[in-house]
Interface confidence: low
């Protein structure tokens, strides 16, 4: 679909004369009537197959004719087609005269005809103006002539139909030739596909609209680059969605169930020793005078023996007291009342004075103790054995029998074959006499947790659309990510038919 | 223990728009793994899920009220809101906020609730 | 939206029984995305049953839930005086989330 277009410049018929030669009265009224037809090698009389168009009258006689266009006038003459323009064309255009008002072809004598002139020829579809001129014995006519298209019609035959548009069908404007140039942010063939945010990630992100990036399930940032961890995972990360992969010393289907008790959570108390004895589970090897599963309790002041010199000890309601055997004194009984003279020392120790014989020193034989050397050293009164190991006398040193799992100098060490976390999948380890067992939590079996019996939801491929099939591990379902242009549980509708809900 | 408190007017005229707050305390806003709601409960005790907000600003809404309603998320403050505009009386209705675990939209904590009225 | 439909409108029972509530729904649900509410005059819902029969932390083990498709069912092993309430079914893998009418359990 396009326009010829026609613009008389100029008319010349200087001596006002019609085609017959006879003049006009009193001048020639002169109007034009053009003929746009399809191309013949010789211009013939017959229909105006591609149009006709008639003016008023412009002028008398010589005239130049007023380009009109910006006015809502007629010249240019405009002569539409809704056809592809074939490249060629036959143009006739007639000068006539009007003796009176009524210009139509019945009413005008047959030798009203000023000049006739016919061309043909090849025109191409563009902007630019043709100027012709063409001449008779008696009249000059200067002209100009082009082809444009249509609104929305493009292309060297104005055959290619383009209207810019910026909705849900297409965001584009049109190109010279036709074709489709994407408003920003858009792409595709008829640009309905929004360019998502850059770096938006190709599988698990995707847009409605430009510079977006909205994430498929299981996945999440800002450019859904980053899986999301099975719901509930405690102490885990995950590569793919829905995993639940533990940090170091967290074990169990939620990475919830701690397998490092001690560093996390520092449970015992009053400066006591902490050992990890599997799941969640722990022991406490607490400093003299504290007892209780944390060593959270303070023991009687007397249980730490705190009366010297033999003296005994008795509990009292604001703390203790020493009754001090005779010669000794003091809060301890640390006091002596006697000196080297009186043989204090027992069991061959050999006696020193001090402060001018005030007082003295007992120095004790080995296995013997005490200011005045009167105990035999019994080196397992402070419980010096860890894990209820038992404590031996043996001469002058001692010994710590170790319940199994333990070993060192104080049954400090433990060897307990749970220590190296051997139950997969968050199993609790328990430590046997001659070895150990797992008890596995739903869904794993095997001497170790290794075997999974739980039920793979996605054996049946349960997901349309070459969507990926994730299994949820607590729940023995499946979770379907879907590809671009799907939505619904399981990826079965085409995004646009139900109402999509990005979860 | 996550705790949700809505506050804002009792009262509200009709054709202007409703505005409520839910300040979320005991938990965090900003966790990935939530969605933050508003519910309502018609006199007639219907329920009924106006639409939730994640912690990144992105929103869904009950496409029968889409046209009226904006949710949005200030996670410095620790609160979610509420507009819903062009109100009617048809809009009177106790107002829940809740807190949806992502992926799984049931709502294990809700806040006490607010009646709103829509009267002039 | 799919549409719950809960039954019997109102359960009228004495302490001690049995309970039984029914949720159907307009079209098939993923027995992962119901969930089942309680609730008391002038208090907020609270969560019995996630997952059409997981219960909710701190919920007693009379409360039960089963069922998948379009046919769900909420049960109340032996009603306690604090049962007698509002119940709501509630979905949730379509949008936008629905709930169902209500059953009531009032004391006969």
């Known amino acids: 679909s396009g326009v010829f277009q026609l613009q008389l410049q100029e008319f010349i018929n200087e001596r006002g004369v019609l085609a017959s030669g006879r003049p006009c009265e009193p001048g020639c009224r002169t109007f034009f009537r053009v003929c746009l037809k399809h191309f013949q090698a010789v211009v013939s009389p017959g229909p105006c197959t591609f149009g006709t168009v008639s003016t008023p009258v412009l002028g008398t006689n010589s005239f130049a004719v007023r380009d009109d266009s910006s006015g809502g006038g007629r010249n240019p003459l405009q002569l539409p087609f809704n056809f592809t323009w074939p490249g060629t064309f036959s143009l006739i255009i007639e000068a006539w005269h009007a003796p009176g008002d009524d210009l139509r072809p019945e009413a005008l004598p047959p030798d009203a005809l000023i000049s006739k002139i016919a061309i043909q020829g090849s025109l191409a579809v563009g902007q630019n103006w043709l100027l012709d001129e063409q001449t008779s014995t008696l009249t000059r006519l200067r002209y100009s002539y082009r082809v444009i298209c249509s609104d929305n019609y493009y292309g060297d035959n104005c055959s290619r139909l383009c209207k810019k548009r910026n909705d849900h069908f297409g965001h584009y404007v049109c190109q010279p030739d036709g074709n489709l140039s994407c408003l920003p942010g858009w792409t595709g063939e008829y640009c309905q596909q929004p360019i998502c945010l850059s770096g938006c990630h190709e599988q698990n992100g995707y847009c409605s609209k430009p510079a977006e990036c909205l994430c498929r399930p299981g996945w999440q940032g800002r450019l859904c680059n980053e899986c999301i961890p099975h719901n509930g995972c405690r102490h885990g990360t995950c590569s793919t969605p829905w995993q639940c992969t533990c940090d170091e010393g967290w074990g169990g289907l939620f990475c919830d169930q701690d397998l490092n008790y001690c560093t996390h959570h520092s449970p015992c108390k009053n400066g006591a020793t902490c050992s990890n004895s599997g799941q969640r589970s722990y022991t406490c090897t607490c400093r003299p005078g504290y007892t209780g599963v944390d060593c959270e309790l303070e023991l009687s002041e007397c249980d730490s023996n705190p009366c010297r010199n033999g003296g005994s000890c008795k509990d009292q309601e604001d703390g203790y007291h020493c009754l001090c055997p005779p010669g000794y004194y003091g809060l301890h009984c640390e006091h002596s009342t006697l000196s080297c003279a009186d043989s204090p020392c027992f069991n061959g120790g050999s006696c020193r004075e001090r402060n001018q014989g005030a007082n003295y020193a007992c120095e004790c034989p080995p296995n013997f103790t005490g200011s005045n050397c009167e105990k035999k050293v019994d080196r397992c009164t402070s419980n010096p054995c860890a894990n209820g190991g038992q404590c031996l006398n043996r001469g002058p040193s001692r010994m710590c029998r170790c319940r199994p799992g333990f070993t060192g100098t104080y049954c400090e060490l433990h060897v307990s074959d749970c220590a190296r976390n051997p139950c997969a999948h968050g199993g609790t380890c328990h430590d046997l006499e001659n070895g150990l067992m797992c008890t596995c939590p739903a869904g794993f079996s095997g001497r170790r947790c290794e075997v999974r019996t739980s039920i793979d939801a996605c054996a049946s491929s349960p997901c349309f659309n070459r969507a990926t099939c994730y299994t949820d591990l607590s729940t023995d379902t499946f979770v379907c990510n879907c590809p671009y242009g799907f939505v619904g549980s399981r990826c079965e509708f085409p995004v646009g038919l139900p109402p999509s809900f990005p979860w | 223990q996550v705790q949700l408190q809505e506050s804002g007017p009792g009262l509200v005229k009709p054709s202007q728009t409703l505005s409520l707050t839910c300040t979320v305390s005991?938990?965090?806003?900003?966790?990935?793994?939530?969605?933050w709601s508003w519910i309502r409960q018609y006199p007639g005790k219907g329920l009924e899920w106006i639409g939730y907000?994640?912690?990144?600003?992105?929103?869904h809404y009950n496409p029968s009220l889409k046209s009226r309603l904006t949710i949005s998320i200030d996670t410095s403050k620790s609160q979610f809101s509420l507009k819903l505009s062009s109100v009617t009386a048809a809009d009177t209705a106790v107002y829940y906020c809740?807190?949806?675990?992502?992926?799984?939209?049931?709502?294990?904590?809700w806040g006490q609730g607010t009646l709103v009225t829509v009267s002039s | 939206e799919i549409v719950l439909t809960q039954s019997p409108g109102t359960l009228s029972l004495s302490p001690g029984e049995r309970a039984t509530l029914s949720c159907r729904a307009s079209?098939?649900?993923?027995?992962?995305?119901l969930a089942w509410y309680q609730q008391k005059p002038g208090q907020a819902p609270r969560l019995l049953i996630f997952?059409?029969?997981s219960r909710a932390t701190g919920i007693p083990d009379r409360f039960s839930g089963s069922g998948s498709g379009t046919d769900f069912t909420l049960t109340i092993s032996r009603l306690e005086p604090e049962d007698f309430a509002v119940y709501y079914c509630?979905?949730?893998?379509?949008?936008?989330?629905?709930f169902g009418g209500g059953t009531k359990v009032e004391i006969k």
């Open positions: 005991g938990g965090s806003i900003s966790s990935g793994g939530y969605y």
């Open positions: 509630q979905q949730y893998g379509s949008s936008p989330l629905t």
């Open positions: 997952g059409a029969s």
């Open positions: 079209q098939s649900v993923s027995s992962r995305y």
């Open positions: 907000v994640h912690y990144s600003g992105s929103t």
């Open positions: 809740a807190r949806a675990p992502r992926g799984y939209h049931y709502f294990a904590y």
